[in-house]
C-alpha cells in the first residue's frame, strides 16, 4: 500500500489580476463519497493552510464565504482557483486530498504547484 497519488501542475503563473488556477487530480483507491481538499502553501520553511473544502461526490465544492479559493469538481478532478494573490504570495501550493467516507481513510499529497505572482506595474499618469 502506498500513499494515494495526487497530480497537479508543476508551475502556474498568476494573471495580472492576481488569479491563479490549477487542476488537482487524485487516483481514488475506492469509491469515496466524501472528499476533503486542502490547499497548503510552503514558502521560507513555513507551511500555512490557504483554504479547505469538503464535498460530496457529484456536488459542488464549497469553500467558506471569506475564502480566497473557489473550485469545481468533476469525478476525481478538482479545478481550483485562488484569487487576490500578490507578489509576496509566490510559493509552492500543495494539494492535499483526503477520502473521508466511507472507510478506509486515504490521504494523498501532490508534489506542489509553484505559483508565481507578479504585481502589475502602476499605470503612468497621463497628461490628458
Amino acid at each position: 500500500c502506498k500513499a494515494m497519488h495526487v497530480a497537479q501542475p508543476a508551475v502556474v503563473l498568476a494573471s495580472s489580476r492576481g488569479i491563479a488556477s490549477f487542476v488537482c487530480e487524485y487516483a481514488s483507491p475506492g469509491k469515496a463519497t466524501e472528499v476533503r481538499v486542502t490547499v497548503l502553501r510552503q514558502a521560507d520553511s513555513q507551511v500555512t493552510e490557504v483554504c479547505a473544502a469538503t464535498y460530496m461526490m457529484g456536488n459542488e465544492l464549497t469553500f467558506l464565504d471569506d475564502s480566497i479559493c473557489t473550485g469545481t469538481s468533476s469525478g476525481n478532478q478538482v479545478n481550483l482557483t485562488i484569487q487576490g494573490l500578490r507578489a509576496m504570495d509566490t510559493g509552492l501550493y500543495i494539494c492535499k486530498v483526503e477520502l473521508m467516507y466511507p472507510p478506509p481513510y486515504y490521504l494523498g499529497i501532490g508534489n506542489g504547484t509553484q505559483i508565481y505572482v507578479i504585481d502589475p506595474e502602476p499605470c503612468p499618469d497621463s497628461d490628458f
Epitope: 500500500c1 502506498k2 500513499a3 494515494m4 486542502t38 497548503l40 510552503q42 520553511s45 513555513q46 507551511v47 500555512t48 493552510e49 509552492l92 500543495i94 492535499k96 483526503e98 481513510y105 490521504l107 494523498g108 499529497i109 508534489n111 506542489g112
Partner: nanobody, 127 residues
Framework: EVQLVESGGGLAQSGGSLRLSCAVS????????IGWFRQAPGKERETVSC??????SYADGVKGRFTISRDTAKNMVYLQMNSLKPEDTAVYYC??????????????????????WAQGTQVTVSS
C-alpha cells in the same frame, strides 16, 4: 489501508525515561514520514519529532532529550524520551504523511501534512 497503533505511554518521574512505540500496518515505512505529536490539556497539538528514510527532525524543546528511530524490518517507529520534564506531560500521537521531495528539515514534521493518526497514548511526568 494504513493504520498506526502506539504503545509505551505511562507515568514517569521528572528526569526519567520512557520509550514510545508506533506500529505501522498496511504499508512499508518507506513511502511515509512518521511523526510524533503531543497535545497537553487546553493546548493545541504540537510537533515533537519525525523521521523518514534519510533524516530525522526535532522540535526545539526536545532536541538533545528525545531520539526518534525506525526499524523497517518490524515496521516500527520509536520515540526514546530521556530527561523528562513535567511540561512533557501530554497525550502523544504518532501519525503518517506521504514522503515528498519538497519537504525540508523544517517542514517535514508540519502537522498540516499528516493525515493517518493513531489513537494517542498518555504520558504523565510527575515532579
Amino acid at each position: 489501508e494504513v493504520q498506526l497503533v502506539e504503545s509505551g505511554g505511562g507515568l514517569a518521574q521528572s528526569g526519567g525515561s520512557l520509550r514510545l512505540s508506533c506500529a505501522v500496518s498496511g504499508s512499508t515505512l518507506d513511502p511515509f514520514v512518521i511523526g510524533w505529536f503531543r497535545q497537553a490539556p487546553g493546548k493545541e497539538r504540537e510537533t515533537v519529532s519525525c523521521i523518514n528514510r534519510n533524516r530525522a527532525s526535532y522540535a526545539d524543546g526536545v532536541k538533545g532529550r528525545f531520539t526518534i528511530s525506525r526499524d523497517t524490518a518490524k515496521n516500527m517507529v520509536y520515540l526514546q524520551m530521556n530527561s523528562l520534564k513535567p511540561e512533557d506531560t501530554a497525550v502523544y500521537y504518532c501519525a503518517a504523511s506521504p514522503d515528498k521531495a519538497f519537504y525540508t528539515d523544517q517542514t517535514m514534521c508540519n502537522i498540516h501534512y499528516y493525515g493517518y493518526w493513531a489513537q494517542g497514548t498518555q504520558v504523565t511526568v510527575s515532579s
